[in-house]
């Protein structure tokens, strides 16, 4: 039961995380105009990965797409790439994890296959989360660098009369969404990897213990017939009757008349 819960929770957390990564990637507020000592501005600038926007005091908002690839900074291109890779890996991970979920039964899929799929999706989520965190962090670093550069020459005097105020940009909401979403995807991936360990069938269900009887040298394996069939280690053996109650996590996936409803 704990494994199913861990796997399910990992899936949900990753799903939320990937939705957040997608949202962050699409958001326009990656960087917003720093208002420093002026909280009310007549013209407010903010920028995303795909377009830059201006919101006027009048309420009018105008957004312009970056209609160039070569003219964009390499760092911005790198951030875009990281976020897209994160989304793609996350989406594939979600697809894989759906089939890996213990609560969903697909044909005669064995637990070992589900365990492998869970591990695969977990790794994909981890990499996806790391890509998002890396992308957001690279952009944040770029902002910090530019912020201090523009602060250094914020007022450039022209003959001592005319001032040109350089627009400074600070962290936008998308950065925080991206960091949180990346973290959630990462956590979800770790949970999936943990669930994988619980899903993977052990080599043998019972450890062999040697008993030295007087006069005879016989190795006794507890579990009788069950052990001799290798039920725990070889799932390809024919199904044997076991009347004992099992927890959901112990149930093996065997085809039955209920599997193809």
């Amino acid at each position: 039961m704990a494994v199913t819960a861990c796997q399910g929770l990992g899936f949900v957390v990753s799903l939320i995380g990937i939705a957040g990564i997608i949202a962050a990637t699409c958001m326009d507020q990656w960087s917003t105009q720093d208002l420093y000592n002026n909280p009310v501005t007549a013209v407010f600038n903010y920028q995303g990965l795909w377009r830059s926007c201006v919101r006027e005091s009048s309420g009018f908002t105008e957004c312009r797409g970056y209609f160039t690839l070569l003219g964009l900074p390499a760092m911005l291109q790198a951030v875009r790439a990281l976020m897209i890779v994160g989304i793609v890996l996350g989406a594939i991970g979600l697809l894989v994890s759906i089939f890996a979920l213990k609560c969903i039964r697909i044909g005669s899929m064995e637990d070992s296959a589900k365990a492998n799929m869970t591990l695969t999706s977990g790794i994909m989520f981890i990499v996806s989360g790391l890509c998002a965190i890396a992308g957001v962090s690279v952009f944040a670093n770029m902002l910090v660098t530019n912020f201090w550069m523009s602060t250094a020459n914020m007022y450039t005097g022209m003959g001592g009369m005319v001032q040109t105020v350089q627009t400074r940009y600070t962290f936008g909401a998308a950065l925080f969404v991206g960091w949180v979403a990346g973290g959630l995807t990462l956590i979800g991936g770790v949970m999936m990897c943990i669930a994988c360990r619980g899903l993977a069938p052990e080599e043998t269900n019972y450890k062999a213990v040697s008993y030295h009887a007087s006069g005879h040298s016989v190795a006794y394996k507890p579990g009788g017939f069950k052990a001799s069939t290798g039920f725990g280690s070889n799932t390809k053996n024919k199904k044997i009757y076991d009347g004992g109650a099992r927890t959901e996590d112990e149930v093996q996936s065997y085809p039955s008349k209920h599997d193809y409803v």
């Epitope: 009048s58 309420g59 105008e62």
Partner: antibody, heavy 118, light 113 residues
Framework: QVQLQESGPGLVKPSQTLSLTCTVS?????????WHWIRQPPGKGLEWIGY???????NYNPALRSRVTISVDTSKNQFSLKLSSVTAADTAVYYC???????????WGQGTTVTVSS | DIVMTQSPDSLAYSLGERATINCKSS????????????LTWYQQKPGQPPKLLIY???TRESGVPDRFSGSGSGTDIFITISSLQAEDVAVYYC?????????FGGGTKLEIK
């Protein structure tokens, strides 16, 4: 077409409070725009006083901030200006206006002349 | 506050002539975010409220004759009347629309010679 009309007393005594109201017709004051007050002393240029949004958020000219209060009454489709401790320097034509693209003012009231005199 | 300086205070041109009014700001009105200059031009006739002519320094308001055009960038912006008409006699004001408080130029009175 949005129309604005200022109303209020034409004569105010020094040190008293000037009160003006702008009635908006042909559109709702809750449309999301900022509604402004601008004044023009006789024979001089224009001076921006401040604005109000229908939500009640305001922004005033720092030169007048300590004396200005702009309020809104969405039910009456009106917004008002109060200027306290007036002096002869506050004698002007007071306009209400609505902002639009480029932070420009395409819609103005006809203006109301306010004279500060004892 | 951004100081708007208009020059000259008054101008006289003959009908049909090209008239140009200059507006200088103490700070650049150019916004890099949308590559626009936040300067507005108004025309005011006696006893009337100002009438919007041009916003974003060069965008003509609907209904404004095409003889009116705006140009310039940053701190020096102009309004040009390509062929002066009798009805263009008025006072012209420029407005800083870039930052609060909004400020206006002192006005330029345009007259017929």
């Amino acid at each position: 077409q949005v129309q604005l009309q200022e109303s209020g007393p034409g004569l105010v005594k020094p040190s008293q409070t000037l009160s003006l109201t702008c009635t908006v017709s042909g559109g709702s004051i809750s449309s999301g725009y900022n509604w402004h007050w601008i004044r023009q002393p006789p024979g001089k240029g224009l001076e921006w006083i401040g604005y109000i949004h229908y939500t009640g958020s305001t922004n005033y000219n720092p030169a007048l901030r300590s004396r200005v209060t702009i309020s809104v009454d969405t039910s009456k489709n009106q917004f008002s200006l109060k200027l306290s401790s007036v002096t002869a320097a506050d004698t002007a034509v007071y306009y209400c206006a609505r902002i639009y693209n480029g932070n420009s003012f395409p819609y103005w009231g006809q203006g109301t002349t306010v004279t500060v005199s004892s | 506050d951004i100081v708007m300086t208009q020059s000259p205070d008054s101008l006289a041109y003959s009908l049909g002539e090209r008239a140009t009014i200059n507006c200088k700001s103490s700070q650049s009105l150019f916004n890099s975010g949308n590559q626009k200059n936040y300067l507005t031009w108004y025309q005011q006739k006696p006893g009337q409220p100002p009438k919007l002519l041009i916003y974003w320094a060069s965008t003509r308001e609907s209904g404004v004759p095409d003889r009116f055009s705006g140009s310039g960038s940053g701190t020096d912006i102009f309004i040009t009347i390509s062929s002066l008409q009798a009805e263009d006699v008025a006072v012209y004001y420029c407005q800083n629309a870039y930052s609060f408080p909004y400020t206006f130029g002192g006005g330029t009175k345009l007259e017929i010679k």
